[in-house]
């Protein structure tokens, strides 16, 4: 079900996103409880995807993101990033919510959640150079799969961001 | 600027085993691959595999699988690979190398490995 | 895995001629083509990397091309210092292979 133009304010800010896609939700209670993604995002698990089509630097990326009160992508399950690689071309690469600041191999990502390196999904060859910072989800021919690459935080790139579901 | 030492020459038993190392200076050491290469005469160049210091990653070649192992000591700035069931075919002199991008751009001065009864 | 075949194994040229040395790749590699010199009791010193880029300090007569699976380095105008072995390696793929190798000496 669609729960359209949705203009009330919460908490008294705007909502950025208008127009809502809301499933209802079964809850134990008699009350009704929806859970919406923004109307163009994608929904999986808690959480909305938003997969952008323009291209910009991973800064500009990140700001792009936090406009729309979300965040670039956070990788927590191997689900998680099956459900994204489908929605994503080939032919181009998106940058996610992962960055080393200073060239010392420490990734941080951007909602601090813990760096974990058992639970990485780098293609084979990377992470190649320390001066490129920035975290990429790109699809490599040989072998033939998705998968993380280090790039320039400059070069402009595509962009997967993140967001938890609006519940009403 | 970037160096890398290799430890001296071996000459060691069949069915022995060696631990090559490889000291890293000029550099974040725990920032970038290091590469083992072996070469014989007659043999051209064979990448063994490769070790990212920072977080122990590993990738080798199939062919050197349960022959070379690596390891990394960030503190010591020291890349080693451990040759284990020494065969004449492993006497060779081993290079590590560190790799920026996909190529290896700076070597050791090489280690000889002779393996002889 | 990707083999990757050089060629030729030896090559006799006169100082001031132009040297071309080929590899060919087993699979599609991009760019992904390291050109290395190795001179007897040294390790292989990088001339030039992936991209087909010319490493710092390297001078300009050594050059390549190339893409995909066929690449080719070149020296313009061979001196008698660049007497040597020469070898490509592929880094586009896990192994990294290397070629077998040219010698270069003087006629």
């Known amino acids: 079900q669609k729960y359209s133009q949705l203009l009330e304010k919460k908490t008294t800010k705007e909502l950025v996103h208008t127009t809502l896609e809301c499933v209802k939700k079964n809850m134990p209670v008699e009350e009704t409880a929806w859970s919406c993604c923004p109307k163009n995002w994608k929904s999986f698990s808690s959480n909305c995807y938003f997969i952008s089509t323009e291209s910009a630097s991973w800064q500009d990326s990140e700001k792009d993101c936090a406009r729309m009160e979300a965040h670039l992508l956070v990788i927590n399950t191997q689900e998680e990033q099956d459900f994204i690689f489908q929605n994503l071309q080939e032919e181009s690469a998106y940058f996610v919510g992962l960055s080393d600041p200073e060239g010392q191999r420490h990734w941080q990502w951007v909602d601090q959640t813990p760096y974990n390196e058992s639970s990485t999904f780098w293609h084979p060859r990377e992470p190649s150079d320390p001066n490129e910072r920035c975290v990429v989800l790109n699809f490599r021919k040989s072998p033939k799969r998705w998968g993380w690459n280090d790039v320039n935080c400059l070069g402009p790139q595509r962009s997967v961001c993140e967001m938890m579901k609006i519940h009403l | 600027q970037v160096q890398l030492q290799q430890s001296g020459a071996e000459l060691m038993k069949p069915g022995a085993s060696v631990k090559i190392s490889c000291k890293a200076t000029?550099?974040?050491?725990?920032?970038?691959?290091i590469e083992w290469v072996k070469q014989r005469p007659g043999h051209g160049l064979e990448w063994i595999g490769e070790?990212?210091?920072?977080?122990?990653?590993?990738n080798d070649n199939e062919k050197f699988k349960g022959k070379a192992t690596f390891t990394a000591d960030t503190s010591s700035k020291k890349a080693y690979m451990q040759l284990s069931s020494l065969t004449s075919e492993d006497s060779a002199v081993y290079y590590c190398?560190?790799?920026?991008?996909?190529?290896?751009?700076?070597w050791g001065q090489g280690t000889l490995v002779t393996v002889s009864a | 895995e990707t083999t990757v075949t050089q060629s030729p194994a030896s090559l006799s040229m006169a100082i001031g001629e132009k040297v071309t040395i080929r590899c060919v790749t087993s699979?599609?590699?991009?760019?992904?083509v390291n050109w290395y010199q190795q001179k007897p009791g040294e390790p292989p010193k990088l001339l030039i990397s992936?991209?087909?880029t010319l490493r710092p300090g390297v001078p300009s007569r050594f050059s390549s091309s190339g893409y995909g699976t066929d690449f080719v380095f070149t020296i313009e105008n061979m001196l008698s210092e660049d007497v040597a072995d020469y070898y490509c390696?592929?880094?586009?793929?896990?192994?990294?292979?290397f070629g077998g190798g040219t010698k270069l000496e003087i006629k």
């Open positions: 190398a560190r790799r920026g991008g996909y190529s290896f751009a700076y």
């Open positions: 000029g550099y974040t050491f725990s920032s970038y691959w």
């Open positions: 390696l592929q880094s586009g793929n896990l192994p990294y292979t």
């Open positions: 699979t599609d590699i991009d760019d992904d």
């Open positions: 070790i990212l210091p920072g977080s122990g990653r590993t």
């Open positions: 992936e991209g087909n």
